[in-house]
Interface confidence: low
């Protein structure tokens, strides 16, 4: 493998063995430079498995506002605009990283936390269990 | 809003106005205790807008492995199992936070970074532009 030497400009760490706490720069670098901010803003309405977006706000978390998708129907919208219950609307979930203030109400110390969020919905063929 | 007093047990910070660099405890707290790890593992195949998952690996980032969804078709799968081009498969995208080593190869200093990932696909009615 390639030998990557330790950068001499690294901050000092009190415990060289195994840092439990690290320094994180909150000046967020955004890699999404050329993305259209409205990229999927109307998919929630146009989808055959439409969803509503619910605001989840927590001042002790960063980011403090997360939008959660909730599927509108158990079934999917068919070509006639009706709900077809032979298909299922299901949430697409993703684990994301957030920062949680710890101790609470501290402006400059956090703990990493993993949370599961529903990003949107998709229409799937149901799994049918046949009873013998 | 509710005034939350500053916790007297907070670590000292040099810049009380707005911490650009904060301390983060790396003992990750996982809130997804009761989630089924296979929760949406087969949706990518069962969806009417199926997708493939592509592995994006970067050892200098946390999480180092991110799975990116790529829709399999321009159209959606109809009841006969054929691709219907009167509908569109579109990616559902989400901005997520990741940590990147900064300076590179330092064990205990990071920068927050926002990246846009495609989590899955959904089937939408296309926007039809009528030419006068």
């Amino acid at each position: 493998g390639i030998t990557i030497p330790r950068n001499p400009g690294c901050p000092n760490s009190e415990d060289k063995n195994f840092p439990r706490t690290v320094m994180v720069n909150l000046n967020i670098h955004n890699r999404n430079t050329n993305t259209n901010p409205k990229r999927s803003s109307d998919y929630y309405n146009r989808s055959t498995s439409p969803w509503n977006l619910h605001r989840n706000e927590d001042p002790e978390r960063y980011p403090s506002v997360i939008w959660e998708a909730k599927c509108r129907h158990l079934g999917c919208i068919n070509a006639d605009g009706n709900v077809d219950y032979h298909m299922n609307s299901v949430p697409i979930q993703q684990e994301i990283l957030v920062l949680r203030r710890e101790p609470p109400h501290c402006p400059n110390s956090f703990r990493l936390e993993k949370i599961l969020v529903s990003v949107g919905c998709t229409c799937v063929t149901p799994i049918v269990h046949h009873v013998a | 809003g509710i005034t939350i007093p500053r916790n007297p047990g907070c670590p000292n910070s040099e810049d009380k106005n707005f911490p650009r660099t904060v301390m983060v405890n790396l003992n990750i707290h996982n809130r997804n205790t009761n989630t089924n790890p296979k929760r949406s593992s087969d949706y990518y195949n069962r969806s009417t807008s199926p997708w493939n998952l592509h592995r994006n690996e970067d050892p200098e980032r946390y999480p180092s492995v991110i799975w990116e969804a790529k829709c399999r078709h321009l159209g959606c799968i109809n009841a006969d199992g054929n691709v219907d081009y009167h509908m569109n498969s579109v990616p559902i995208q989400q901005e997520i936070l990741v940590l990147r080593r900064e300076p590179p190869h330092c064990p205990n200093s990071f920068r927050l970074e926002k990246i846009l990932v495609s989590v899955g696909c959904t089937c939408v009615t296309p926007i039809v532009h009528h030419v006068a």
């Epitope: 493998g1 390639i2 030998t3 990557i4 330790r6 195994f18 840092p19 439990r20 690290v22 990493l112 | 790396l26 003992n27 990750i28 690996e57 050892p59 200098e60 980032r61 946390y62 999480p63 180092s64 492995v65 940590l99 080593r101 064990p107 990071f110």
Partner: nanobody, 119 residues
Framework: EVQLVESGGGLVQPGGSLRLSCAAS????????MYWVRQAPGKGLEWVAE????????YYVSDVKGRFTISRDNAKNSLYLQMNSLRAEDTAVYYC????????????WGQGTLVTVSS
């Protein structure tokens, strides 16, 4: 699919030695720090040792320093832990873990190998 398979555990007398191995697959082994983690009966997980990508830097928890040696062979996608001067308190299930850039988070580990130190 990421897989980590440990081997080499067993029953050994105090003062004895064992060499644990871990075979890795499903990821770019040479790109990641690797770890040995252990869990003693009735206790929580304890980090034991870390080795950087190229093997040049190793870290140890204080009570194994000088007795345990972590090493790796990137050509074979393998991680090792040489354990000498074993003590009863080293009895535990030893896990090999794939490192992330965050040194306290292991996203994958194996099924573990039991090391019992007893006379």
């Amino acid at each position: 699919e990421v897989q980590l398979v440990e081997s080499g555990g067993g029953l050994v007398q105090p003062g004895g030695s064992l060499r644990l191995s871990c075979a890795a697959s499903g990821f770019t082994f040479s790109s990641y720090s690797m770890y040995w983690v252990r869990q003693a009966p009735g206790k929580g997980l304890e980090w034991v040792a870390e080795i950087k990508q190229d093997g040049s830097v190793q870290y140890y928890v204080s009570d194994v320093k000088g007795r345990f040696t972590i090493s790796r062979d990137n050509a074979k996608n393998s991680l090792y832990l040489q354990m000498n001067s074993l003590r009863a308190e080293d009895t535990a299930v030893y896990y090999c873990a794939k490192g992330e850039i965050l040194p306290l988070y292991f996203d994958y580990w194996g099924q573990g190998t039991l090391v019992t130190v007893s006379s």
